[in-house]
Each structure stands twice: as C-alpha cells, then as structure tokens.
Interface confidence: medium
C-alpha cells in the first residue's frame, strides 16, 4: 500500500496550487455559480496571467464557450469577480477585439476563442470551478492500492479518497439531472 498525496478530486485538474473542474454540460451563469458552490468551489476567479493562459488554453482546445466568475451585473461597465474583487487593469487585455460590447444586456464574461467575450447571463454554457488544492498533511493522506509513487506535483486530474469521489459524483449527478435550454 502506498501513501499518496492527491491534491485534487477525480476529474479535476491541478495547476499552481489550485484545482479546476471543466464542466461537460452547460448552465446559465447564475446556475454555474451554484454548481461550483455545491462542490465547495467557486466559479473561476482569475488571479494571474499564468492562470489566465492555462484556462484560456483549456477552453480554446475544447472549442467551448465557457463561463468565468466575472460580470458587470452590479454596475454596468464595472467588471467585478464573484469574490468581489475588481478587474485589474492588466486583465483588460484579455477581451477579444471590440469586447466587451454589451450588445443586448451582455453582463457576464466567457472564454471565447483566444480571449474573453461578454454575453447574456441567461445563456447555457460550459463553466469552470476553482478551489484550493489539498494541503496533504499526514492526516489527509489517502490509502490507495496498488499505485506507483507520483512525483511532486502530482499529475493533472489525479485524485483520491472518498470525499473526492463523492464530490466528483455530485458534479456528475448535477450534470446529468440539470438540463438548461
């Protein structure tokens, strides 16, 4: 039996100390927030250029329009993350050409192609949840058998432990039972 540290739940991706869940179903922006909250996460709030590059790549590779936790719902033209933090000046460069354009009440931000776009919040899109990776103290180490020893940091998408499995199942259950048109 190996003692392994798995910082992220099954089906989640590890990057720079955080875990990310890229949905396989679609929800509107508000329901995407709820989906993330239900698994102890948050609709993704981007904190660095490296994180943005990583997430943009995931989104563009899969060719999906994907919600992030950014909107100007509180005040038109003032973009704010779901954690209450403002959009930093350097992040404005991620908007696609001519965006945000607020055509027809477009108040929520999505990954679109190589940058960001604003779109109507009631549209169903894929979403990304983010939460801190497990610290992997001795009490949190999981027993998995058999398994090879993993290098540090563990590979993306690795996971382990009953809590992780339940969380992954919870996401899967919601994805199969919530249909938004």
């Amino acid at each position: 039996t190996e003692r392994l540290c798995h910082p992220c739940p099954w089906e989640w991706t590890f990057f720079q100390g955080n875990c990310y869940f890229m949905s396989n179903s679609q929800r509107n922006w508000h329901d995407s927030i709820t989906a993330c909250k239900e698994v102890g996460a948050q609709l993704v709030v981007i904190k660095s250029a490296e994180e943005q590059n990583f997430l943009q790549l995931q989104s563009s590779r899969s060719n999906r329009f994907t919600w992030m936790g950014l909107s100007d719902l509180n005040q038109e033209g003032t973009w704010q993350w779901v954690d209450g933090s403002p959009l930093l000046p350097s992040f404005k460069q991620y908007w696609n050409r001519g965006e945000p354009n607020n055509v027809g009440e477009e108040d929520c931000a999505e990954f679109s192609g190589n940058g960001w776009n604003d779109d109507k919040c009631n549209l169903a899109k894929f979403w990304i949840c983010k939460k801190s990776a497990a610290s992997c103290s001795r009490d949190e180490e999981q027993f998995l058998s058999p398994a090879p020893a993993t290098p540090n940091p563990p590979p993306a998408g690795s996971g382990g432990g009953l809590n992780d499995i339940f969380e992954a199942q919870k996401i899967e259950w919601h994805e199969h039972h919530h249909h938004h048109h």
Partner: antibody, heavy 122, light 106 residues
Framework: QVTLRESGPALVKPTQTLTLTCTFS??????????VSWIRQPPGKALEWLAL???????YYSTSLKTRLTISKDTSKNQVVLTMTNMDPVDTATYYC??????????????WGRGTLVTVSS | DIQLTQSPSTLSASVGDRVTITCRAS??????LAWYQQKPGKAPKLLIY???SLESGVPSRFTGSGSGTEFTLTISSLQPDDFATYYC????????FGQGTKVEIK
C-alpha cells in the same frame, strides 16, 4: 491613417501646472479596448510611463507621480488631456502620447505621437 | 511596481552581426512584454508584442523570445538602419520600461 499629435507649452516655470493635449485621428476612444497613454523621456534618459485612460474612462497613474497627474478625455474632439501640477526642472522631458490597440494581445503601445519637448526653468 | 533590467546598456556591433539584448523582470510577467526601437529625436517604434509576436511591417530579422522573467530580442543580421536604442516594456501590471540598450557601430 492613424496619427497622434501632442501640443502644449514648450516652457513652464517651476511650481506651475503643465497641461498637455493629445489630438488623434484614425481611431475612436469610444471603441472597446482602445486606450491612450502619456509617456515621457528626459533628455538622454529612458522612457517613463505616466498615465493611461481607457475607452470606458478608467484611469491609471504612475505610482510615483499619481498625486500630481490628472488624465481626461474628450471623445467628441478626439483628445486626451494630461495635467501635471507643481512642475520641477527634473520634469524637463519630451512628452509622448501613444495608443493601446484593441484586441486580446495586450496593452502595449502600437502608435506614438512625435512628442513635445517641455522645459521647466525659471 | 515591476522593474525591468536590460543588458547590456551599450552594445557595439558591426553590420551583419547577430545581436541579442536581454530584459529581466523583477517578477513573472507571463509573456506580456513588448520591444521598441528608438532613433535620436524620434518617437519609439513598436517591434515585438506579447514577447514574440512581430508587429506588422517590421523586418523578420527581429525576433523576440522568453516568458516569465527572462526575455530576449535578437537581430539575426544587423543592418545599417538597426543602429538605435531598444527598450523592453511590460504590461502585465500597469506599464514599465527597461532602461534601454544602445546598439552602436563598432
């Protein structure tokens, strides 16, 4: 054709307020992603970014000079104005305005004015 | 604030030489870096943006590379028109310039 042109006094006295105007053509500061910035260069020295104003009227200032600077825009006139208070001889420099393009490749400066030399002396 | 340090400050080279200028950032700026060329009495001219993207109309002998904290501008074969001062500029967090590298005739 896109152009930017700086205008303002060539000479100001110490403690006075400097007002510079950037008049541009070929683009609109109401277009998403477009910004106009002020950058200066003392004689024989490096470039120093001063201030930037976005299409949505967000304003950003150099941390070391923010108490002295004010940037504003008049979209209808295609102008951006910079005021700098309490001028000192060390503020003698060529002052440039420059444009930040629209798009998701970053907020660099793709087009510059020719610059205007401002001398601070009594 | 993010500081940019260019090296060398001055570079003596001949026509046809391969020239490399380095720019180091005080913290990671991903690939949000631009390079400019400036000639005496003239405004800076954009050469490279996003660390390695060549601005339209700029000769292909200019190439940019790097990410994170270390970046380079390379001129593959120096031409008479290339003797100038070169500046790097970051736009990851506000905007700052390097102190410049003067490329002069050897």
């Amino acid at each position: 054709q896109v152009t930017l042109r700086e205008s303002g006094p060539a000479l100001v006295k110490p403690t006075q307020t400097l007002t510079l105007t950037c008049t541009f053509s070929g683009f609109s500061l109401s277009t998403s992603g477009i910004s106009v910035s002020w950058i200066r260069q003392p004689p024989g020295k490096a470039l120093e970014w001063l201030a930037l104003i976005d299409w949505d009227d967000d304003k950003y200032y150099s941390t070391s000079l923010k108490t002295r600077l004010t940037i504003s825009k008049d979209t209808s006139k295609n102008q951006v104005v910079l005021t700098m208070t309490n001028m000192d001889p060390v503020d003698t420099a060529t002052y440039y305005c420059a444009r930040t393009p629209s798009g998701s490749y970053g907020r660099y400066f793709d087009l510059w004015g020719r610059g205007t030399l401002v001398t601070v002396s009594s | 604030d993010i500081q940019l340090t260019q090296s060398p400050s001055t570079l003596s080279a001949s026509v046809g030489d391969r020239v490399t200028i380095t720019c180091r950032a005080s913290q990671s700026i991903s690939n949000w870096l631009a390079w400019y060329q400036q000639k005496p009495g003239k405004a800076p001219k954009l050469l490279i943006y996003k660390a390695s993207s060549l601005e339209s109309g700029v000769p292909s002998r200019f190439t940019g590379s790097g990410s994170g904290t270390e970046f380079t501008l390379t001129i593959s074969s120096l031409q008479p028109d290339d003797f100038a001062t070169y500046y790097c500029q970051q736009y990851n967090s506000y905007w700052t310039f390097g102190q410049g590298t003067k490329v002069e005739i050897k």
